[in-house]
Structures are given as C-alpha cells and as structure tokens.
C-alpha cells in the first residue's frame, strides 16, 4: 500500500488483511459516496481471520494469523491505524493468539471474543482499554467459538454462531458487562460459522457463513424485543469468512469464500426495501478480512 497521507474524508469502509493463497497485508478503504477505493498503508504483518473495529477515530486490527509459505502463526497482536497519518503502530498484545476472532466495542473498550490458537478453540474473552494500553480477561463465554460473529447492541455484547472444534453452531449468547456474565439467547434458525454479524436498527443481523456442508447466502436478524430470529432477503452470493459493516443505515458485506472462489464482491443491504445489490468489487478476491467504518 501507499505510504502517503490518506485523504481527510468523513466515513470510509476499511478492509484490512484477508486471505488469497496466503495471508494479506492490504489496507484498503471504500468510499460509498463516490465508489472509489483508496490504497493505504499495509499492515506490518500479513494476517487473515482478524477483526477490525474503530475507537476514537482510530482503526484497530485484532488477532488473526499469518498463513504464509514460510509457516503459519496465530496472532495475539493488536495494531492501531491512524487515518490522519496513514500509519500503523503496535499496541499491547492479547493474552493469547486468536485466529478467526470476533470483536465488539462498548464504551470505548474493545472486547476480543473466542478465536483459535492452533487446535485450541477459545471460550475466553478479554477487554482492551485504549487509554491504558492494557488487556484484561473478563468472564468466558459459555461455548468455545471460532469464526464467531460479534455485535454490540444497547451496551450488550452478542456472540453468534461459530465453530467449537467439533460442531458448527447456531447458538448465540449475550454478555452483560455490569454483571460480567454471559447468558444464552435464542438460537438462530441456521447453523452459521464464519458469518457476518452486525447491528442495524435495533436488530442483530447474521449474514452467510458455513453450516458444516455449504456456504450460505441466507440472512436472518434477531429482534431483542421479541427474542426471535427472522429471515430477510438472501445475499446474491453464498459466502463464509466474509467481512461486514454498517454504513449510513445499510449493511455492507465484503469478500469471503463461496466454496470455490475467493470473492471480490461487495453487496449492500437496504432494510427499507429488503434487497441486496452489488455495489462494488474489491481490488482482489479474499476471505477473512477485518472490516470497520470510520466515525463521523
């Protein structure tokens, strides 16, 4: 990626890392307002299976692994990208490596959920405080989960689906920070590992994933009031290990793997019309990206 200064634009969809033949170090940003892509500063170490989030206008890349011809190393790294300087800097590492991690942000703190280290599938969860550059373990999930989808709604952290080392999961659970405890919620209608999970209009959406046999294009959403999952329109492409984010009231899904191909497709969901549309293509196909949107 380019090492020049990034343009000072308002809200961009950032995609970091991913996998195509090997783990990638790309950082690219899509501007939905004009359909352009920016090539930004590479990650210092290639990684796939990472997660992305934004805190205080800074982009964080969390966990993953570097799968390269020279070897395969799971990552405990936390790296911070400053859009104003177009530079990455390392932060304190997590207590354990976490590939295929999920992350969520509550009150400016990053929660790192599940993931794997070698064949170990974590149920552990840790919280990062950016102002102190420190990680601390919190209560573990009730279930081991890698390829877990994580979302935050009403200051509660939801962990959805994934793989426990034996089975792909349709179960989901919710973390209550004040009580430091997890509780199971209603299971999804569909087993999903490697799904894209996000929050839009007071609902948790779970898009795509892998059910242990096939990649999925189905999408369902959880209404916290009724505690039910309901299907919405399916995506155009089946995909697992996809990236997902919300931008101006619409869901964007990026890349993934369809069982044959590493997708470059980016689709956008409009909840008003319950439709998906192809909006752009990434510069190359990839799975296992970390995605986040800059704050206003």
């Amino acid at each position: 990626g380019s090492m020049g200064h990034a343009p000072k634009v308002g809200r961009l969809i950032y995609t970091a890392g991913g996998y195509f033949r090997q783990s990638l170090s790309y950082l690219e940003a899509y501007n939905p307002s004009d359909g352009t892509w920016l090539d930004l500063a590479d990650l210092q170490v290639p990684r796939s299976g990472l997660a992305g989030c934004v805190v205080g206008g800074l982009l964080y890349a969390v966990g993953g692994r570097n799968n390269s011809p020279d070897g395969n190393t799971d990552s405990s790294a936390l790296d911070c990208y400053n859009p104003m300087t177009n530079q990455w800097s390392p932060c304190a590492p997590m207590s354990v490596p976490r590939n295929r991690i999920g992350v969520g942000v509550i009150d400016g703190h990053i929660y790192a959920v599940g993931g794997s280290h070698g064949c170990i599938h974590h149920n552990s969860v840790e919280r990062y405080e950016p102002e102190r550059d420190e990680w601390h373990l919190v209560a573990p999930m009730l279930t081991r989960r890698i390829g877990v989808g994580v979302a935050v709604l009403n200051r509660l952290l939801y962990a959805v689906g994934g793989f426990d080392g034996t089975n792909r999961l349709n179960s989901a659970e919710c973390y209550y920070p004040e009580r430091n405890e997890w509780r199971m919620i209603t299971a999804m209608n569909t087993i999903r590992s490697g799904a894209g999970v996000c929050v839009l209009h007071n609902c948790i959406y779970a898009a795509g994933g892998y059910d242990g046999q096939d990649q999925l294009n189905s999408v369902e959403r959880y209404d916290v009031e009724t505690e039910t999952w309901t299907f919405v329109a399916p995506m155009k492409h089946r995909r697992s290990a996809l990236g997902i984010t919300v931008h101006q009231g619409r869901i964007y899904v990026l890349g993934g793997y369809d069982g044959h191909t590493f997708l470059d497709s980016v689709e956008c969901y409009d909840p008003d019309t319950d439709t998906w549309s192809e909006v752009t293509r990434m510069t190359s196909g990839r799975s296992g990206v970390g995605v986040a949107v800059t704050m206003e």
Partner: antibody, heavy 124, light 107 residues
Framework: EVQLVESGGGLVQPGGSLRLSCAAS????????IHWVRQAPGKGLEWVAS????????LYAKSVAGRFTISADTSKNTAYLQMNSLRAEDTAVYYC?????????????????WGQGTLVTVSS | DIQMTQSPSSLSASVGDRVTITCRAS??????VAWYQQKPGKAPKLLIY???SLYSGVPSRFSGSRSGTDFTLTISSLQPEDFATYYC?????????FGQGTKVEIK
C-alpha cells in the same frame, strides 16, 4: 458407505507434474478439513497439505510449499493435489484424509476417514 | 516444528500381553494427539483422538493417556489382529507431525 478414493498416481520424471484426485462418497467432502498425508516406501507418515472448507485457507508442509497446491471442488465432491517440480524424495503413497468428519473432535486432530492411497514414483 | 519421539520403534509380544507405546512431544501439545493403526498396504485407521478419547467402533482394549508432554497408547490384551504399526500424531500446532512409528510383531 463413507469412503475416499484417490487416483492419479503413477511414474513421473523429476521435474514433472501430477494431479492427484480424492473422490468422496457417502458424505460431503466439504464437511471438514481435507488433508493429504504421504508415506515414502518403508517409512512413516508425513502430513503434506490441508484445505479448510469454511475459509478456503490452505496449509502446506515446508517440503512441498510452492510446488504443491491443494484444492477442492464441492460440486464434484472431490479434492485435488496438484504436484509440480516433482523430486525423487516425493516418491510415496499419497493418502487423502478428512479431519474429524465422523465423530473425532477436530480440535483433537483425529483423521477418521482415509482413502486407500495412490502411489507416486518420481524417477528417471 | 514439534517432534514426536515414539518408542519403542518395534516390540515383540504375545497374544494376551499388555502393550504400551509412548510418544514424547518436544514441547507442549496440550491434548491434541491422535493414535493410528496401520497394516501393510493399508491406510491408517484412527484409534484415539484428543489423547484419550476412544474413536467410535474401536475395541475398548485400546486406550490413550497423557502426562504432560508424554502420551501413551495401551493395548490391554493383545489380539491377533492387533499386530501392526502404530503412529502418534500431534495437531496442536502447524505443521502437524507424526511419530516415527512402532511396529508390534508376534513373539
């Protein structure tokens, strides 16, 4: 019946190429990670490569990285191992195997469905 | 790479004997160890996974245990069909590695 059947082995000259196939029946090859393991004549087992059906990620032993490519076609329920720049030390019986597809915990590493193997001989 | 040092490389035993085969990992592999049986000209068969879990359909005379980085396969009462070569395998970290094998022969 749950089974894997390899094919494509044979005699090839050093520097040559072969493509091995592993056809699954009785279950979906996408149900778990697919591995190739080889065994040189009179020797032990050596893990070669794997592919994750969920992410598409592949892993290779250092001895074959850059020369071998593992892939899968779920529509044909078949996995492949493309072997290029073959060397005498690649001579072996090649087995495909599935990790934990039928009850062995994937985290514990048990490969519980194996093919019968196909012999690859690299010699001039 | 993690080395799995298997011992003995061969042993002679009689039907009814108790047989113990050991694998020592060069570093921690948690419980991510499997054991296989292989007969000449055949593919390996899974016996034990996760160090001590008996795979479905495998006779209960086979058992596995772990003590730190030492892993043991025990055949409590050797049967004629058990004469074969046995391999351990770790899948804790990349790359997965096998022990060199133990050949169990008839005394």
């Amino acid at each position: 019946e749950v089974q894997l059947v390899e094919s494509g082995g044979g005699l090839v000259q050093p520097g040559g190429s072969l493509r091995l196939s592993c056809a699954a029946s009785g279950f979906a090859i996408s149900a778990s990670s697919i591995h190739w393991v080889r065994q040189a004549p009179g020797k032990g087992l050596e893990w070669v490569a794997s592919i994750d059906p969920e992410t598409g990620e592949t892993l290779y032993a250092k001895s074959v990285a850059g020369r071998f490519t593992i892939s899968a076609d779920t529509s044909k329920n078949t996995a492949y191992l493309q072997m290029n720049s073959l060397r005498a030390e690649d001579t072996a019986v090649y087995y495909c195997a599935i990790l934990g597809a039928w009850g062995a915990n994937a985290g514990g590493g048990g490969m519980d469905v194996w093919g019968q193997g196909t012999l690859v001989t690299v010699s001039s | 790479d993690i080395q799995m040092t298997q011992s003995p490389s061969s042993l002679s035993a009689s039907v009814g004997d108790r047989v113990t085969i050991t694998c020592r990992a060069s570093q921690s592999v948690s419980s991510a160890v499997a054991w296989y049986q292989q007969k000449p000209g055949k593919a390996p068969k899974l016996l034990i996974y996760s160090a001590s879990s008996l795979y479905s359909g495998v006779p209960s005379r086979f058992s596995g245990s772990r003590s730190g980085t030492d892993f043991t396969l025990t055949i409590s009462s050797l049967q004629p069909e058990d004469f074969a070569t046995y391999y351990c395998q770790q899948s804790y970290s990349f790359p997965s590695t096998f022990g060199q094998g133990t050949k169990v022969e008839i005394k």
